[in-house]
C-alpha cells in the first residue's frame, strides 16, 4: 500500500523537531523539493532541510550511545558488582587471617606479641597490596616475615638472657635464619601456598577489572559518519515524509547495526575465550590455589614453624652462639 | 598442635550471615558468577541484535520503515531496500576495528594468555614439590573442610570459608528473581521477531 501523503503543512514534523531543537527556523512551512538533502533522499516533496538532517545525525549518534549502554547494562552491573564484592571479600579474608595469626601469637607466644603483631601486620598489608596489583614479590614478603620473627624468637624464647637485642645481632640472626634453615621447610611451604593462591586471586580480580574496561570501551565508541547516516536514515528519515509513528523494520535494524558494529563484533572471539579461560581459572581455585583457604590457615603453619624452631632449640642456640659470637661480644661489652 | 582461635570464628559481628538458609562461600559465589557470565558468552556477536531489541522496532505493527518507504513487515523489501543505493555495507565492514577496539582486543589476548597459564590442570591441584613435603597426609580433601598444609600433628582443619563474609551483610543473590533471565536466552529470542 502506498504511504500516506505527507503532512501538507509540515506541522507534525515541526512540533516533533521542536522537542529535539528548540527554535523552529529550520523546518520548512510546507513540503519542499529537498534537493540539497544528502541522507534522507526524497522521492517527492519533503518536510526536512539540510540543517535538520545534520541535527538528526547528531541525535542518532547520541541515541546510539545510550542504546549501546542499555544493551550492556546488565553485563556491566554483573561484573562491576562482583568485582566490588570479591575485592571487599578478599580484604575481609586478609583481615581475618591477620586476626587469626595475631590470636595464635597472643595465646601461644605472649612474649613475642608486640613485635610479632607488627611483623604480621606488615606481612598482611603487603598481601593486600599484592592482590590489588602492587609490584611486590611474594617470596620476599614471606622471607621478610620470618627474617623479622626469628631475632625476636631467639632473643625472647631461646636465649632470653641476652640484653635487649641490638641491630648487630639482629642482622646476624636474620642471616642465620636462612643459612641454617631454622624454620625447616615451612617458609618454602608458605611461599608456595601464598604465592600460588595470591597470584590466582590477583589475576582473577585483574580479569574482572579488564572485563569492565572492555564493556566501557564498547559503551563509549564513537561511530563513523557512515554509521551516523545509516542510523539517521533508519530512525529519522520517515519523519521527513510526515510518518511520525512508523518504526523501523526489525530485519533492517539488524542489517544497519551489523554495519555500525562491524569493528566491535571482532571482540567476540576474544570475549568468548575470556569467559572460558576465567571459568577454567575459577575451577582450579581450591586448596592451595584458594587464598581464603591458604590465608585462613596460615596461623597454623606459622605456629608449626615456631614449634619446629623450639624442637631444635638446643642445637640452634649452640650453632648461632658460634655464628653470631662476634655480634654478641660487641653487645656484651 | 596450634591453639585454634575459635573465639574469632564465632565472633557474631564478623561472621553473621544475612540469610542463613543460603550460606554462601567465596568459591560458590565465583562459580555463580561464571554461570551468569556464560549466559553473556555471545554478547558481542549478538550485540547488533541486542541494540535493536532496545530500540523502537516494529514488533506488532503491520507496516514498518525500511529506510526509504513504508513496507509490510514481512515483505522482501523490509530489510533490503533501505540499504540499496545508500552506503556500501561491505565497505563499512572492511574498515576494520578502530584503534580503541584493537587496543582492547590486545588487552583481552594478554589476559586470556595469563588466565590460561594460571589455570590449574585437572588433577594437578597439589604440586609435586608440595607432595614431597608431606602435604597430602591425613584425610583432608572433602568439600566442607580443607587442609592447610603442615606436617605432623599440626594439621588443622579450617572451617570452610567465612560463610560468605557477613560484612557484605546483605543478600546479593537475586539472580533467580522472575524476569531476570539473562541476555543470552531472553533477547536472542526477542530479536528474531522482526526479521524479513
Amino acid at each position: 500500500q502506498p504511504p500516506p501523503p505527507p503532512d501538507a503543512t509540515c506541522h507534525q514534523v515541526r512540533s516533533f523537531f521542536q522537542r529535539l531543537q528548540p527554535g523552529l527556523k529550520w523546518v520548512p512551512e510546507t513540503p519542499v523539493p529537498g534537493s540539497d538533502l544528502q541522507v534522507c533522499l526524497p522521492k517527492g516533496p519533503t518536510c526536512c532541510s539540510r540543517k535538520m538532517e545534520e541535527k538528526y545525525q547528531l541525535t542518532a549518534r547520541l541515541n546510539m550511545e545510550q542504546l549501546l549502554q542499555s544493551a550492556s547494562m546488565e553485563l556491566k552491573f554483573l561484573i562491576i558488582q562482583n568485582a566490588a564484592v570479591f575485592q571487599e571479600a578478599f580484604e575481609i579474608v586478609v583481615r581475618h587471617a591477620k586476626n587469626y595469626t595475631n590470636a595464635m601469637f597472643k595465646n601461644n607466644y605472649p612474649s613475642l606479641t608486640p613485635q610479632a603483631f607488627e611483623f604480621v601486620g606488615e606481612f598482611f598489608t603487603d598481601v593486600s597490596l599484592y592482590i590489588l596489583g602492587s609490584d611486590i614479590n611474594v617470596d620476599d614478603m614471606v622471607n621478610e616475615l620470618f627474617d623479622s620473627l626469628f631475632p625476636v624468637i631467639y632473643t625472647q624464647m631461646m636465649n632470653p638472657g641476652l640484653p635487649e637485642s641490638v641491630l648487630d645481632i639482629n642482622e646476624c640472626l636474620r642471616g642465620a635464619r636462612r643459612d641454617l634453615k631454622v624454620f625447616g621447610s615451612f617458609p618454602k611451604l608458605i611461599m608456595t601456598q601464598v604465592s600460588k593462591s595470591l597470584q590466582v586471586t590477583r589475576i582473577f580480580l585483574q580479569a574482572l577489572n579488564l572485563g569492565i574496561e572492555v564493556i566501557n570501551t564498547t559503551d563509549h565508541l564513537k561511530f563513523s559518519k557512515d554509521c551516523g547516516r545509516m542510523l539517521t536514515r533508519m530512525w529519522y528519515c520517515s519523519y521527513c515524509q510526515g510518518l511520525m509513528m512508523v518504526k523501523p523494520c526489525g530485519g533492517y535494524c539488524n542489517v544497519v547495526m551489523q554495519g555500525c558494529m562491524a569493528g566491535v563484533v571482532e571482540i567476540d572471539k576474544y570475549w568468548r575465550e575470556y569467559i572460558l579461560s576465567l571459568e577454567e581459572l575459577v575451577n582450579g581455585m581450591y586448596r592451595i590455589y584458594d587464598m581464603e583457604n591458604v590465608l585462613l590457615g596460615l596461623f597454623s603453619t606459622i605456629h608449626d614453624s615456631i614449634q619446629y624452631v623450639q624442637k631444635n632449640g638446643g642445637k640452634l642456640t649452640t650453632t648461632i652462639g658460634k655464628l653470631c659470637a662476634h655480634s654478641q661480644q660487641r653487645q656484651y661489652r | 598442635s596450634a591453639y585454634y582461635p575459635e573465639d574469632l570464628f564465632i565472633d557474631k559481628k564478623i561472621l553473621k550471615v544475612a540469610h542463613v538458609e543460603h550460606e554462601e562461600t567465596l568459591s560458590s559465589r565465583r562459580r555463580e558468577l561464571i554461570q551468569k557470565l556464560k549466559s553473556f558468552i555471545n554478547f558481542y556477536s549478538a550485540l547488533p541484535g541486542y541494540i535493536c531489541s532496545h530500540s523502537p522496532v516494529a514488533e506488532n505493527d503491520t507496516l514498518c520503515w525500511n529506510g526509504q518507504e513504508l513496507v509490510e513487515r514481512y515483505s522482501q523489501k523490509a530489510a533490503r531496500n533501505g540499504m540499496k543505493n545508500q552506503f556500501n555495507l561491505h565497505e563499512l565492514k572492511m574498515k576494520g576495528p578502530e584503534p580503541v577496539v584493537s587496543q582492547i582486543i590486545d588487552k583481552l589476548k594478554h589476559i586470556n594468555q595469563l588466565l590460561r597459564t594460571m589455570s590449574v590442570p585437572k588433577g594437578k591441584v597439589l604440586d609435586k614439590s608440595l607432595d614431597e613435603e608431606g602435604l597430602e597426609s591425613g584425610d583432608c580433601g572433602d568439600d566442607e573442610d580443607e587442609c592447610i598444609g603442615s606436617s605432623g600433628d599440626g594439621m588443622v582443619k579450617v572451617k570452610n570459608q567465612l560463610r560468605f563474609l557477613a560484612e557484605l551483610a546483605y543478600d546479593l543473590d537475586v539472580d533467580d528473581a522472575p524476569g531476570n533471565k539473562q541476555h543470552g536466552n531472553q533477547k536472542d529470542n526477542e530479536i528474531t521477531t522482526s526479521h524479513s
Epitope: 542499555s70 566490588a84 564484592v85 571487599e88 569492565i212 | 546479593l172
Partner: antibody, heavy 120, light 107 residues
Framework: EVQLQQSGPELVKPGPSLKISCKAS????????MTWVKQSHGKNLEWIGL????????TYNQKFKGKATLTVDKSSSTAYMELLSLTSEDSAVYYC?????????????WGQGTSVTVSS | DIVMTQSQKFMSTSVGDRVSITCKAS??????VAWYQQKPGQSPKALIY???NRHTGVPDRFTGSGSGTDFTLTISNVQSEDLADYFC?????????FGGGTKLEIK
Amino acid sequence: EVQLQQSGPELVKPGPSLKISCKASGYSFTVSPMTWVKQSHGKNLEWIGLIHPYNGDTTYNQKFKGKATLTVDKSSSTAYMELLSLTSEDSAVYYCARWGNYYPYAMDYWGQGTSVTVSS
Amino acid sequence: DIVMTQSQKFMSTSVGDRVSITCKASQNVRSTVAWYQQKPGQSPKALIYLTSNRHTGVPDRFTGSGSGTDFTLTISNVQSEDLADYFCLQHWNYPYTFGGGTKLEIK
C-alpha cells in the same frame, strides 16, 4: 539497616555550582550503584544518572550531561552530585537512591531528599 | 527516550476497595518495570520490582502485573495509609524514565 543521609536544604543564587552529598550506611557501599533523581514541582521524577562506587564509573541521562557531575568518596561511603551553572530551572528536590543489591532490583532505598532553591 | 504514560493523574477509592493503576511504555520494556509509592512530604518508597516482585516489607495487598508495554499496580483492600502518589519506572533503556504519577485519594 540501609540508610541514605542527604545534606540539608540549599537556597542559592544563580551561578557556578552546588555540591550535595549522600552518606550511605548499613550496607557495603562499593557493591551497589548509586542513582540520583530530580523531582520538580512535587511530582515529576527524572533520572539524572548513576555511579558505581567501586570504580567511579558513571552513566548519565543525556539531558543532564554537563549539568550534573557524580562522584563518590569510598573512604566515607559518601556519594556526591555537583550541579553546574545553576538557574531557576534547577530548583527541585534531589534524591539519591541505592540501586538494589543486584541488577534487576531497581532503586530500593532512597535518601530523604535535598531541596534546592535557586533564586536571585 | 522511552515514555512511560500513567493516564490517570488522580484516582479516588474507598477503604477496602480494589484499585488498579496503569502504566504504558512507548516501546517494549520486557519486565523491567518498578513501582514506587510517595506519601506527602516523604521520599519515594520501593514497592514492586521487575513487574511483579514485592520488595521486602511491602504488604501483599500490593501486586504488580503486565509485560511488554502495559503494566498495572493493583492494591486490593485499600487502606487509609495508601493515600499517596504512585510512580512507575522503566529500566530497560537508558535513560531510565518514570511515569508522571497517579495520586490515589481516599474518599
